[in-house]
């Protein structure tokens, strides 16, 4: 069915799912429609994310399905928003040297967290698990985000960009092949095996202690052993 | 309100297997890990396993592998943890317990397993 | 795996004592820490995560503090229902719990 979802052909095969992992559980982070930031045991439509990386090291982070950027207000709280506020919606990336990745508020230095307390990032620290990310490419088919294309003959420039703020619904070329080091998928998740139904189930290994290939937050991150 | 209820009271003899149940309610039971926790008599608190309930995956403490299975039933909200080969140091209360990132929130009201010949 | 050891195993009190009880890890844990009370037969109850957040209806006079290694729960006030047994909790690579501290009466 190439034709079955609208979204089929444009950059959301680029979607990926940022998720905390300790040796025995992981946990995604998700947009809710209402603006609700929480973490789910699995990838949902809700935790497909795109992550616009920007000069100096700062992120964009927006939840396609529910159409908000991830944000952070002044005590540390993480929300998603329609709106595009440059002090609350950018966050610094880094990467630790466990190879999992931190993002901090250059505006209020707290760290973006699935755990309810509110830390501030400092160099050198090591956050708790909750507060570490990888990435993982998005297992869930594009049938499952099918949303209408916006309808442009019948809005505004303003009212297009404010649906589609990453313009993530207008087509562009196709993602190149991950490079090698990149190659260990999961099964595809018409696939009927058991990872396939898990893409990220019940993390078996602790922490890890290498870089793997990719830069960005899109690239290639380390992960633990799933079951 | 979020409650999880656990099955009654149970005496097995050595050798034997116990199903203990957990049934949740008051949140989507899709969206947290529960994990099953132990405490012999005047004992303390002893990790046993935790299970994603979507997919059913579970992992277990290296001291129960292969003795314990934990499965889940989405459509009821509930999850289980069977115990095999008895023992009688394997009397103890067990409890679900829910995952909520940063810490077990809510908990059952426990099972009491008592193993006797 | 991470061991946690909890000191003291035991203690005795009096209603109004300022009561501190420690927890040290094997190895560095940051702040995934959390604290519970259980009395006899009942459940364990969350008092304090991520080290030093007090859970939700829990009253003030209970504190955590720490990070890294050694970590420590302190009532400020000891009142008559604070007599329990005290757990603490790791949740950085595992789920370990401490032995427990057990609170009575002097």
């Known amino acids: 069915y190439p034709n079955a979802s609208p979204l089929l052909g444009s950059s959301w095969g680029g979607l990926i799912h940022l998720y905390t992992a300790t040796a025995r559980n992981s946990y995604h982070l998700q947009i809710h429609k209402n603006g609700h930031v929480d973490g789910a045991p699995h990838q949902t439509i809700y935790s497909a994310l795109m992550i616009r990386s920007e000069d100096a090291g700062f992120v964009v982070i927006t939840g396609v399905m529910s159409r908000r950027y991830l944000c952070m207000d002044f005590r540390g709280n993480i929300f998603g928003s329609h709106y595009f506020d440059p002090e609350n919606c950018r966050f610094q990336h880094q990467t630790l040297e466990n190879g999992y990745d931190v993002y901090h508020s250059p505006q209020y230095h707290f760290l973006v967290s699935l755990g309810r307390a509110k830390r501030a990032f400092l160099p050198g620290m090591n956050p708790p698990p909750y507060s570490q990310f990888l990435s993982r490419r998005n297992e869930i088919p594009l049938i499952h985000f099918n949303t209408p294309i916006p309808r442009r003959h019948t809005q505004s420039a303003e009212d297009d960009s404010e649906r589609d703020p990453l313009n993530v619904l207008k087509p562009r070329a196709r993602m190149t092949p991950a490079p090698a080091s990149c190659s260990q998928e999961l099964p595809s998740a018409e696939d009927n095996s058991p990872m396939a139904s898990d893409p990220l189930g019940v993390v078996r290994g602790g922490r890890v202690n290498t870089h793997a290939g990719g830069t960005g937050p899109e690239g290639c991150r380390p992960f633990a052993k799933f079951i | 309100q979020v409650q999880l209820v656990q099955s009654g009271a149970e005496v097995k003899k050595p050798g034997a297997s116990v199903k203990v149940s957990c049934k949740a309610s008051g949140y989507t039971f899709t969206n947290h890990y529960m994990h099953w926790v132990r405490q012999a008599p005047g004992q303390g608190l002893e990790w046993m396993g935790i299970i994603n309930p979507i997919s059913g995956s579970t992992s277990n403490a290296q001291k129960f592998q292969g003795r314990v299975t934990m499965t889940r039933d989405t459509s009821t909200s509930t999850v289980y943890m069977e115990l095999s080969s008895l023992r009688s140091e394997d009397t103890a209360v067990y409890y679900c317990?829910?995952?909520?990132?940063?810490?077990?929130?809510?908990w059952g009201q426990g099972t009491m397993v008592t193993v006797s010949s | 795996a991470i061991q946690l050891t909890q000191s003291p195993s035991s203690l005795s009190a009096s209603v109004g004592d300022r009561v501190t009880i420690t927890c040290r890890a094997s190895q560095g844990i940051s702040s995934a820490l959390v604290w519970y009370q259980q009395k006899p037969g009942k459940a364990p109850k969350l008092l304090i995560y991520d080290a030093s957040s007090l859970e939700s209806g829990v009253p003030s006079r209970f504190s955590g503090s720490g990070s890294g290694t050694d970590f420590t729960l302190t009532i400020s006030s000891l009142q008559p229902e604070d007599f329990a047994t005290y757990y603490c909790?790791?949740?950085?690579?595992?789920?370990?719990f401490g032995p427990g501290t057990k609170v009575d009466i002097k």
């Open positions: 909790q790791q949740f950085n690579d595992d789920f370990t």
């Open positions: 317990a829910r995952d909520i990132v940063d810490a077990f929130d809510f």
